[in-house]
């Protein structure tokens, strides 16, 4: 059976995912990241609240954090636009946009990803790709190279039940199942990837990781196009 | 190679329920979805739903409800369908498939051997 | 649902010939699968994600398109591949196939 990796997941092929980034708080990988534009990663917000005083970069191009990789490129950050609606005490808006200090080198293991625009809802069961550099179990124990998981979309409904999230998940928010196999801490800001396509943003909330009654959550890019549009404009 | 070997061919009535399985050759069942595909006379192919044997989280095609119900055996590497309340419809063609890679873009990379079920008096 | 229609839905053609197959989608599909499938056996993956290659296949196949339009194309048609080729999307569930198109070799 799966030994976590993400939680019930596995290790990644080497590099297929070019669109993966790793957002790294001195040296050291903080979240995950997604590459949607040559010279931009989307991140979640949260996931700098505790970064004031470091220095923030960005690693594309990788599979092991720690072993060199002719495509591996830690790139520093010329400026984060978190969104204006982003606050500590709340899911919502958490999403992160880090101007990198040059255009991405872009090859077979650098390559943006393209990130869904049509404001639809993705179909419960929908089996979606999650991928980070996050805890694989309990104790807390990190992966060196990257780790993926498939899991299934979960109605909204289902999400929002009282024994679940309790309304908190709003039309700008999506759940997947979180039974066994699920995000967890350090996936923050990485993709949710359906049919090929971005679809979410892992949100950096504190939540228990693995539980079927607390699904994870992620922020639908598409209900933040005009926001992304601008930015990157 | 991981190959799916599935039960052989049934022979059923109107009405009867028919249990098909699908056994995984490899140790790592747990680890990957199991889906069912229906292939009616035409070649029609109707993806009927997936089980996750690692949690049980199933999903099924609006279309199969109340028609298949997937379960697993973990400890066989077995992967199992039932069809209930069956009619001439169900004849068919019967796979259980999955994707035991690790790109992003899943697709069924291992299709069973197939289970032939014919519906007749 | 995702309704994926085939065409032709039967294809005859010579040896050396080039070959191309469409596969339209009611509503935009970013990646389209393809799998072959000959009678009597269970269907191969043939074309994942619109272009790359399933194992073992050949280099004389190829798949291109975007949004409702997919196509797989055989740039020199031989006799091994008569077969029926079916496009599948798994942008959304439920997940849906084509109704086919049976190549054939004259």
């Known amino acids: 059976p799966p030994r976590g990796r993400i939680l019930g997941g596995r290790e990644a092929e080497a590099h297929a995912r070019p669109y993966m980034a790793s957002v790294q708080l001195n040296g050291a990988h903080l979240c995950g990241g997604v590459l949607v534009a040559e010279q931009w990663v989307l991140s979640a917000a949260h996931c700098l609240e505790d970064a004031a005083d470091g220095k923030v970069q960005v690693l594309l191009g990788a599979h092991s954090l720690s072993q060199p990789e002719p495509s591996k490129r830690l790139y520093d950050v010329l400026r984060a636009v978190p969104h204006p609606d982003s606050q500590p005490d709340t899911i919502d808006h958490d999403l992160l946009l880090l101007q990198l200090s040059e255009k991405a080198t872009l090859g077979p293991a650098v390559r943006p990803l393209p990130w869904q625009r049509v404001d639809r809802d993705v179909a419960p069961g929908t089996l979606c790709d999650v991928a980070g550099w996050g805890i694989v179990n309990h104790a807390g124990r990190r992966p060196d190279s990257l780790q993926h998981v498939l899991l299934p979309v979960l109605d909204r409904a289902t999400c929002n039940r009282r024994t679940h999230h309790d309304g908190a998940i709003t039309e700008r928010l999506m759940c997947a199942e979180s039974n066994r196999r699920d995000s967890c801490k350090g996936d923050s800001g990485g993709p949710l990837v359906c049919g090929g396509v971005l679809e979410g943003v892992v949100t950096s909330g504190s939540r228990v990781c693995g539980n079927r009654k607390k699904p994870g959550i992620y922020t639908r890019v598409a209900s933040y196009a005009a926001w992304i549009d601008s930015v990157l404009a | 190679e991981v190959q799916l070997q599935q039960s052989g061919p049934e022979l059923v009535k109107p009405g009867a329920s028919v249990k098909i399985s699908c056994k995984a050759s490899?140790?790592?069942?747990?680890?990957?979805?199991m889906h069912w595909v229906k292939q009616s006379h035409g070649n029609i192919l109707d993806w009927i739903g997936y089980?996750?044997?690692?949690?049980?989280?199933?999903s099924y095609n609006q279309k199969f409800k109340g028609k298949a119900t997937l379960t697993v055996d973990k400890s066989s590497s077995t992967a199992y369908m039932e069809i209930r309340s069956l009619t001439s419809e169900d004849s068919a063609v019967y796979y259980c498939?999955?994707?035991?890679?690790?790109?992003?873009?899943?697709?069924?990379?291992?299709w069973g051997t197939g289970t032939t079920v014919t519906v007749s008096s | 649902q995702i309704v994926l229609s085939q065409s032709p839905a039967i294809l005859s053609a010579s040896p050396g010939e080039k070959v191309t197959m469409t596969c339209r989608a009611s509503?935009?599909?970013?990646?389209m699968h393809w799998y072959q499938q000959k009678p009597g056996s269970s269907p191969k993956p043939w074309i994942y994600?619109?272009?790359n290659l399933a194992s073992g296949v050949p280099a004389r196949f190829s798949g291109s398109g975007s949004g409702t339009s997919h196509f797989l194309t055989i740039s020199r048609l031989e006799a091994e591949d008569a077969a029926t080729y079916f496009c599948?999307?798994?942008?959304?569930?439920?997940?849906?196939f084509g109704g086919g198109t049976k190549l054939e070799i004259k």
């Open positions: 498939a999955s994707y035991y890679g690790s790109s992003p873009y899943w697709y069924f990379d291992v």
């Open positions: 490899d140790n790592s069942f747990t680890g990957y979805y």
């Open positions: 089980i996750d044997p690692y949690n049980g989280v199933s």
């Open positions: 509503s935009s599909v970013s990646y």
């Open positions: 994600a619109t272009s």
């Open positions: 599948q999307q798994w942008s959304s569930n439920p997940y849906t």
